[in-house]
């Protein structure tokens, strides 16, 4: 997604985004819960094409990794935290069943706030 | 994605979640840049599925329209911003080619900060 | 807790119309694939319509195409069913349902009875 | 159309037994396949989806499984409150979505 650093502007949390194979994925939670297995390839007509994640989490190794950027210190404690959505894969559940299910992966870096007592 | 107001948690941004079918985006921007028509039904072992995609933007409606929450103003001016993510799914592009693409999706609503100048 | 309530039912004559409605609540609406399916008296449950959450799509039985249509208003939470050219064999209990992700249905209403005689 | 043909019409049983009812596809639907309970004056109510993964809130002693053609609804021991009708409905191939014609588990 568009670069905010490229408008001069700074992420109150820095996340890393990547491309992440089912290979390396290898299990997910569906919906419901359950571990499932992501399988590396899908079957399309003419072949088959490798399973990929857009993946985008909290980073690290970043500056935000203490608190998020840019909050009012006095009133809040703040935290960078990982955000994950949905997304429909090829999978199979513990009955050996395949199907497209949806599986929750990173998808962001958020801030959030709690407000600091007995000031 | 879990709620952090349970936790007795603020976000920096509000935003909603929704479900969004595919025979209600219609179109959508592929990773080349170009519009691609986004396919109502994906073909899977013995039966079909409707492509759905899980969608989150910043809240208009919420009380972080005007900025972000907890920010310290006096040294930085706040935006709340969607941002997007790419997802596969089965698209028809221009020349009425059906594929798997990555699409661009909402998918979170982070704070983007700017430095206050000539304070 | 997810709510669904048809109204809209009653007697009506051969080739006469009526408008049935469904309030729901309890989930994001617009989110949704909502669907009417009917069940005639003493006998077994038969799809009849199905829409997008945002109304992009419609899907309709073959027994009704043409003469029933199905909208919904976001706004008011609300699905409909316009039912225009009724015939007796319409006559049924209509259930409005919400679709999973996956094409069943997880919720139902009570329904609501359509008699067409004359 | 896929239809979705559910024997026996009727099963007659005792509180406590076995319940075994089954739904056959006319062609592979993979296991897309769901179950509805419907007692008289009430609405249906999704049991299985899946062919065999139960909905939230259903007893265990309902159980589902089978795929391709052949599916099977199992009540391990029957309850007074389970005496009803049971539908199956395929989502394999739609529109139109089908229902089976149903089986009616009555008290013996």
């Known amino acids: 997604h568009s670069d905010p650093a490229r408008r001069g502007e700074l992420s109150v949390c820095d996340s890393i985004s990547e491309w992440v194979t089912a290979a390396d994925k290898k299990t997910a939670v569906d919906m419901s819960g359950g571990t499932v297995t992501v399988l590396e390839k899908v079957p399309v007509s003419k072949g088959q094409l490798k399973q990929y994640f857009y993946e985008t989490k909290c980073n690290p190794m970043g500056y935000t990794k203490e608190g998020c950027r840019g909050i009012d210190k006095r009133h809040w404690n703040s935290q960078c935290r990982t955000t994950q959505s949905y997304v429909r894969a090829l999978t199979m559940d513990s009955k050996k069943r395949i199907g497209w299910r949806f599986i929750r992966i990173d998808t962001s870096c958020v801030c959030t706030l709690t407000i600091k007592r007995g000031r | 994605h879990s709620d952090p107001a349970r936790r007795g948690e603020l976000s920096v941004c509000d935003s909603i979640s929704e479900w969004v079918t595919a025979a209600d985006k219609k179109t959508a921007v592929d990773m080349s840049g170009g519009t691609v028509t986004v396919l109502e039904k994906v073909p899977v072992s013995k039966g079909q599925l409707k492509q759905y995609f899980y969608e989150t933007k910043c809240n208009p409606m919420g009380y972080t329209k005007e900025g972000c929450r907890g920010i310290d103003k006096r040294h930085w001016n706040s935006q709340c911003r969607t941002t997007q993510s790419y997802v596969r799914a089965l698209t028809m592009d221009s020349k009425k080619r059906i594929g798997w693409r990555f699409i661009r999706i909402d998918t979170s609503c982070v704070c983007t900060l700017t430095i206050k100048r000539g304070r | 807790d997810v709510q669904l309530v048809e109204s809209g039912g009653g007697v009506v004559r051969p080739g006469e119309s009526l408008r049935l409605s469904c309030a729901a609540s309890?989930?994001?609406?617009?989110?949704?694939?909502m669907n009417w399916v009917r069940q005639a008296p003493g006998k077994g449950l038969e799809w009849v319509s199905g829409i997008s959450g945002r109304g992009g799509s419609t899907y309709y039985a073959d027994s009704v195409k043409g003469r029933f249509t199905i909208s919904r208003d976001n706004s008011k939470n609300t699905l409909y069913l316009q039912m225009n050219s009724l015939r007796a064999e319409d006559t049924a209990i209509y259930y409005c349902a919400k679709e999973t992700l996956n094409v069943f249905f997880d919720y139902w209403g009570l329904g609501t009875l359509v008699t067409v005689s004359s | 159309e896929i239809v979705l043909t559910q024997s026996p019409g009727t099963l007659s049983l005792s509180p406590g037994e076995r319940a075994t009812l089954s739904c056959r596809a006319s062609q592979p639907i993979n296991y897309y396949l769901a179950w509805y309970q419907q007692k008289p004056g009430q609405a249906p109510r999704l049991l299985i989806y899946?062919?065999?993964s139960r909905a939230t809130g259903i007893p265990a002693r309902f159980s589902g499984s089978g795929s391709g053609t052949e599916f099977t609804l199992t009540i391990s021991s029957l309850q007074s409150e389970d005496f009803a009708v049971y539908y199956c409905q395929q989502y394999s191939d739609w529109p139109p979505l089908t229902f089976g014609g149903g089986t009616k588990v009555e008290i013996k």
């Open positions: 309890g989930f994001t609406f617009s989110s949704y694939y």
């Open positions: 899946d062919a065999s």
